[in-house]
Amino acid sequence: IWELKKDVYVVELDWYPDAPGEMVVLTCDTPEEDGITWTLDQSSEVLGSGKTLTIQVKEFGDAGQYTCHKGGEVLSHSLLLLHKKEDGIWSTDILKDQKEPKNKTFLRCEAKNYSGRFTCWWLTTISTDLTFSVKSSRGSSDPQGVTCGAATLSAERVRGDNKEYEYSVECQEDSACPAAEESLPIEVMVDAVHKLKYENYTSSFFIRDIIKPDPPKNLQLKPLKNSRQVEVSWEYPDTWSTPHSYFSLTFCVQVQGKSKREKKDRVFTDKTSATVICRKNASISVRAQDRYYSSSWSEWASVPCS
Amino acid sequence: RNLPVATPDPGMFPCLHHSQNLLRAVSNMLQKARQTLEFYPCTSEEIDHEDITKDKTSTVEACLPLELTKNESCLNSRETSFITNGSCLASRKTSFMMALCLSSIYEDLKMYQVEFKTMNAKLLMDPKRQIFLDQNMLAVIDELMQALNFNSETVPQKSSLEEPDFYKTKIKLCILLHAFRIRAVTIDRVMSYLNAS
């Protein structure tokens, strides 16, 4: 058993049928010695008396808010949550496995640049009685500071018969140098509590590996005289690290017909312009990627050929 | 402590092409190592990230773009002095700091070159003959060092009398390649910045 926060405790259980569970001793936070009784949740049934209460915690029915009283007055509370270890693995019932980029990916994180700011998100089908708390650091043995905000519900989607809820959090490394070579990964820890179930999820990454630039901005077409060709031009996104000559991007320019089946023409360039043939009803799209470290491509920025 | 926006003579900054080749070569070698050594801890998540140049060179700090010198987190307290002559300095106006930066890059390359050559000698003794260093990568390191053209004492290749532990050598190779790729990215960024300056 360990303390999650004041008066909230997590009991770790090896989860299998007929498991013996864990013996837990609760102590009433009071100078009083006599006339103390204990109850669980809203029930008025007295579970025991005395300054301490010993319970065998085996299943969720044994978890909840234990309260000690004296003469009708509440003295203190202890909330017991359960953390299940099933098949040698801590349970992951609360969050959905996003399976990208690999199995058992519950937390996904992205950064728009090298400033040390990043966003993480996760999915669940649970809509109520759900709380999250996020902590982060650079490295784990001698951790350096990363400050995270509160997790917020950022999107709701319908997937078949189920509703899916996306939560996200923004974090900022306290003293980040965009040019630094990372040797210690960022660690993100999410505590999730659903009713009386506790779970924790972690992700470990280097900022360089989660970079995904914003799409190029100010995408414009300039027809070339007496030609079906156009000059496409764009700019670096505002959110990208500066100076751009140091933090350079490379670009992919795509000409896509109306039909998805039509052949796509693609050009790769380090410049912020390119000359392409603009077909009728086609659209021109441009996306960006760090020129020197191949992390994710940005989403496409698009303009119609007409 | 930084790179001023110097104005080199017109034309391609001599080392940019070599640094791009270097990044390509080390990235290819790392990919090959990850595929060949798939049953070894060779991915970024599995290895310990070590920097053999730590406390010996200060490339990131010495080559910091002018725009980042206002960022206190970028101003590390490490001081290292380097030899200051070299043919990549395309302009007489190039400052002392730029020379310091380029000589730091040269020292990095020299250190990695020695490590890789020592390691290759061990890998050639492996009866499994599982993996060797790409000669192209070693040649590209050499080319960039020649382009930088700094006079520096030659570091003798380390020789070891004891029987090599091939498992450890292959893990060390992965660690070295990951670190060298990160340094090659920094070198490429620096050369691109200097070229634009």
């Epitope: 989860w15 299998y16 007929d18 498991a19 099933e86 098949d87 | -």
Partner: antibody, heavy 115, light 111 residues
Framework: QVQLVQSGGGVVQPGRSLRLSCAAS????????MHWVRQAPGKGLEWVAF????????YYADSVKGRFTISRDNSKNTLYLQMKSLRAEDTAVYYC????????WGQGTMVTVSS | SYVLTQPPSVSGTPGQRVTISCSGG????????VKWYQQLPGTAPKLLIY???QRPSGVPDRFSGSKSGTSASLAITGVQAEDEADYYC????????????FGTGTKVTVL
């Protein structure tokens, strides 16, 4: 005490279907994940499928993916394995087992796929 | 599809110490716990060891389990005639939720 009683095995022709059942008693069935494991004659144990306590997630071995479906009815305390497009190599004794570091096994049921 | 490797057979005379090895990798034994089962002919596997070294009640103390790195082993100190059976190790795969991975199995013969 914990008991898992299996049924539904038998002889079936290749390409046909069969449904195995596993009736659980002596524990809160709806609180625990369940597995199916099989053993071909004279061979070792092979994991087949797993279902979460609430049926929300199901996982399968590559050898049965797309052909077998694990399911459960918590109101009936029963686990199922629907097997379609059966092949000769699916011939085995099938066991249901509880999840957890300390697990309980059914008595096994023989499935023979033969023409 | 056996991910864990065991010797096909081991033998010993009554009273001898017999050990069975189980070799895996970083994604299974290296990052998860190990169980051992005993299977007598025509019966369901019986749990002998769980959580690497825990013995269920009713399992004689001559059976013991241990784990080190990516390998595990089962020891039978003072093997008896009734211990003649097939033995399987089992772990979980870190990269694949829910999946149990079994050893190839070892036939223990008491001479």
């Amino acid at each position: 005490q914990v008991q898992l009683v299996q049924s539904g095995g038998g002889v079936v022709q290749p390409g046909r279907s069969l449904r195995l059942s596993c009736a659980a008693s002596g524990f809160t069935f709806s609180s625990y994940g369940m597995h199916w494991v099989r053993q071909a004659p004279g061979k070792g144990l092979e994991w087949v499928a797993f279902i979460r306590y609430d049926g929300s997630n199901k996982y399968y071995a590559d050898s049965v993916k797309g052909r077998f479906t694990i399911s459960r009815d918590n109101s009936k305390n029963t686990l199922y394995l629907q097997m379609k497009s059966l092949r000769a190599e699916d011939t085995a004794v099938y066991y249901c087992t509880t999840s957890g570091s300390y697990d309980y096994w059914g008595q096994g049921t023989m499935v023979t796929v033969s023409s | 599809s056996y991910v864990l490797t065991q010797p096909p057979s081991v033998s010993g005379t009554p009273g001898q110490r017999v050990t069975i090895s189980c070799s895996g990798g970083r994604s299974n034994i290296g990052s998860n716990t190990v169980k051992w089962y005993q299977q007598l002919p025509g019966t369901a596997p019986k749990l002998l060891i769980y959580g690497n070294d825990q013995r269920p009640s009713g399992v004689p103390d001559r059976f013991s389990g241990s784990k080190s790195g990516t390998s595990a082993s089962l020891a039978i100190t003072g093997v008896q005639a009734e211990d003649e059976a097939d033995y399987y190790c089992q772990s979980y795969d870190r990269g694949f939720t829910g999946s149990r991975v079994f050893g190839t199995g070892t036939k223990v013969t008491v001479l």
